[in-house]
């Protein structure tokens, strides 16, 4: 970066570097170059020249003010005209940023996906900073008293092998930057409240050309979990609203769910379990997409409905690389 | 007003001495920044920069002529006197006095002929 | 080694917009410059000075139909509303200090033709 040029002198920031955003802040600039008492001394921000707000302090020191700063990172360098020089003498130059003191996290979460080895912990961070803001995830067992911490710059995967003492556990947040330092609440938990089941995953759907047309989604996870509650949500695609359908489930086989759609539209099914009774849900499985087949004429023989029954015209979808959903109301 | 005039032989033979000087008003040689510089040009081609002298004397020469070169001054006759030894044919040109004020020749005086000729 | 770089000549209608180019060698592309006109029979006379970021300042009695700007390595004279007074052959000059030797050097000129 620009800090890493050769000096002939020296640049500073009041009150400093690193400021919040839309403060009022002066930068300084020190000429020491060999033979030169300078002219002028002129200020660059970008690469591009400052005209105003610039007041020569002595013979060789200038400042340039700015009002409401508000951009989050800028490169300043100073230069110098000397007498005999045809060419403006570079002075120094430093990197500045301006940006916000961490907001207290909140929303923490703790969840261990089925499989994954790992307790996962998120945050909300609040509002955006501007400039580097790390974390530090405090776990404290309530068994042994035991304190570990983890630095990040966002979420946090600690794995479960690491977590020795015993089965509570404290977890909080704390956020720090240039400008300041917050901590969360402490949230409790209990590892084995907070297990996420495997994914389930929509494999494919049939629809069933009856008297009444039928669809069935098939749906599987591979968790070993034994008492599971799932909800299958479902709209045709043109509207804005699901409809939900709740499951308690046991995965020793694939699911089948039947649905009595209307024909000719194109639906769009996820699914998502949790372990029953517990507090967080699995994220909303992958959009899986399925059209219903045109309606059959009607026609009032029985034996022509049951023969139409019996040809057995389905119409099929089946999952492939599909869209990942929004992940709204992911967890919890 | 600031003027500038040169004076020279207009004609010297090969390996002979070139003397110019240069006369200025509407400025002082003594004022810090100020400069006082010889520029050349041969006729129908560009311009080029010769020698020029500070205000506390310091003096830069082109690299390429410098052994033959030698600028001075006399700031009470507000005068710049340039030196090339040793002339050639090759350095037939009009010569050029300008004020150098900071990093531009600013002002130019309107130049003087030599021909260097057998 | 520091060069300056232009088009030997260039031609405008009367009443034009004119934009002469000076270009510097690509080592020395933060380099400020200056322009000078030299009107036929005449001396140089200094036009401006033209800065990295396209800032520029001019000389005494220079109309302000001359502006300066300037592109990467590229600085160039505008001459808005051109007329017959302002044919004449435009130079560019840069002076800098290389490995403790001062040197000053210009361009070939560019003859600028008013039809």
């Known amino acids: 970066g620009i800090t890493n040029i050769n000096c002939s002198g020296h640049i500073w920031v009041e009150p400093a570097t690193i400021f919040k955003m839309g403060m009022n802040i002066s930068i300084y600039c020190q000429a020491a170059i060999k033979n030169c008492q300078p002219r002028k001394l002129h200020f660059y921000k970008n690469g591009i020249k400052e005209r105003f707000q610039i007041t020569r302090i002595n013979k060789t020191t200038a400042r340039l003010w700015y009002k409401n700063f508000l951009e989050p990172h800028a490169s300043m360098y100073c230069t110098a005209e000397c007498p005999k020089h045809f060419q403006e003498t570079l002075i120094c130059g430093k990197d500045i940023s301006s940006g916000y003191p961490p907001d207290i996290p909140d929303e923490v979460t703790c969840v261990i996906y089925e499989y994954s080895g790992n307790m996962t912990c998120t945050w909300n961070a609040g509002k955006l900073t501007y400039i580097d803001t790390k974390y530090v995830v405090h776990v404290k067992s309530l068994e042994t008293e035991e304190e570990q911490q983890y630095l990040t710059s966002s979420y946090i995967n600690i794995s479960t092998d690491s977590l020795q003492g015993g089965k509570k556990y404290l977890v909080w947040v704390q956020a720090a930057n240039a400008l300041g330092m917050e901590e969360s609440k402490q949230l409790q938990i209990h590892l084995d409240d907070i297990v996420i089941p495997s994914a389930a995953v929509i494999s494919r759907a049939e629809t069933i050309n009856a008297t009444v047309p039928k669809t069935i989604i098939y749906w599987d996870s591979q968790t070993t979990i034994e008492k599971v509650s799932c909800e299958m949500r479902y709209k045709a695609t043109t509207n804005q609203t699901w409809n939900v359908k709740e499951f308690d489930t046991n995965f020793t086989y694939v699911q089948q769910s039947e649905f009595y759609l209307e024909p000719n539209i194109k639906y769009v099914f996820q699914v998502r379990c949790q372990e029953t009774g517990k507090r967080y849900w699995q994220p909303w499985s992958s959009l899986f997409f399925h059209k219903t087949p045109e309606t059959v004429p009607q026609v009032t023989s029985k034996a022509f409905q049951h023969d139409t029954w019996n040809s057995g015209l389905t119409v099929a979808s089946i999952s492939t690389g599909h869209l990942t959903s929004d992940n709204r109301g992911d967890i919890g | 007003q600031v003027s500038l005039k040169e004076s020279g032989p207009g004609m010297l033979q090969p390996s002979q001495t070139l003397s110019l000087t240069c006369s200025f008003s509407g400025f002082s040689l003594t004022t810090f920044d100020m400069g006082v510089g010889w520029i050349r040009q041969p006729s129908g081609k560009g311009l080029e920069w010769l020698a020029h002298i500070w205000w506390d004397d310091d003096k830069y020469y082109n690299p390429a002529l410098k052994s033959r070169l030698t600028i001075s001054k006399d700031t009470s006759k507000n005068q710049v006197f340039l030196k090339i030894a040793n002339v050639d044919t090759a350095d037939t040109a009009t010569y050029y006095c300008?004020?150098?004020?900071?990093?531009?020749?600013?002002?130019w005086g309107q130049g003087t002929t030599l021909i260097v000729s057998s | 080694q520091l060069v300056l770089t232009q088009s030997s000549s260039a031609s405008f209608s009367l009443g034009a917009s004119a934009k002469l180019t000076c270009t510097l060698s690509?080592?020395?592309?933060?380099?400020?410059i200056e322009w000078y006109q030299q009107q036929p029979l005449k001396a140089p006379k200094y036009v401006m000075e033209?800065?990295?970021?396209?800032?520029?300042s001019t000389g005494d009695g220079i109309p302000d139909r001359f502006s300066g700007s300037s592109f990467g390595a590229d600085r160039y004279l505008s001459i808005s509303n051109i007329q017959p007074e302002d044919e004449a052959i435009y130079i560019c000059g840069v002076g800098d200090t290389i490995k403790e030797q001062f040197l000053y050097v210009f361009g070939g000129g560019t003859k600028v033709t008013v039809l």
């Open positions: 690509s080592q020395h592309s933060t380099y400020t």
């Open positions: 033209v800065k990295k970021d396209g800032s520029h």
């Open positions: 300008a004020r150098l004020q900071g990093s531009d020749f600013d002002y």
